[in-house]
């Protein structure tokens, strides 16, 4: 879930399931002010989903958005 009231978006929990990669439009990382590290995926339907940056699928999605294998 996201802290919607604050200017800084933080992840308090992470998605428990892998999002299909073709649903992902973009991502951003949470602030160092947050208590937990996080990656927030923005879906093509404009949903924001918190994901655990220590999970391999999250890392791969970020690489695929930014870089090429």
């Amino acid at each position: 879930s996201l802290a919607a009231d604050t200017p800084t978006a933080c992840c308090f929990s992470y998605t428990s399931r892998q999002i299909p990669q073709n649903f992902i439009a973009d991502y951003f990382e949470t602030s160092s002010q947050c208590s937990k590290p996080g990656v927030i995926f923005l879906t093509k339907r404009s949903r924001q989903v918190c994901a655990d940056p220590s999970e391999e699928w999250v890392q791969k999605y970020v690489s695929d958005l930014e870089l090429s294998a």
Epitope: S31, S32, V39, P53, S54, K60
Partner: nanobody, 113 residues
């Protein structure tokens, strides 16, 4: 608190090589993807290479085939081997841990023609 210290930069002629190192503390980096970024004067910071916790690597098109990212989990360190350097590779190079909004001081790479 996550701390990152980059080193290994310097002045090198075009076609030369450098190996950058990034030592991390305050975190077990083996769990996370590590990325190398660079920022040239007047330009935006750009991601050049990444390595996942599982060892999968990926690169920006501009450095593919010339740069190699690797990691030593026992040393909490990530490396960037840069071969065939070009003047356009001149920049300050930074490493970053995915999910942690922390940056080191960077290391300057200057490639002369």
């Amino acid at each position: 608190e996550v701390q990152l210290v980059e080193s290994g930069g310097g002045l090198v002629q075009a076609g030369g090589s450098l190996r950058l190192s990034c030592a991390a503390s305050g975190i077990i980096t083996s769990r996370y993807a590590m990325h190398w970024y660079r920022q040239a004067p007047g330009e935006q910071r750009e991601l050049v290479a990444g390595i996942t916790s599982g060892g999968s690597t990926s690169y920006a098109d501009s450095v593919k085939g010339r740069f190699t990212i690797s990691r030593d989990n026992a040393k909490n360190t990530v490396y960037l081997q840069m071969n065939g350097l070009k003047p356009e590779d001149t920049a300050v190079y930074y490493c970053k841990v995915l999910g942690f909004d922390r940056w080191g001081q960077g290391t300057q790479v200057t490639v002369s023609s």
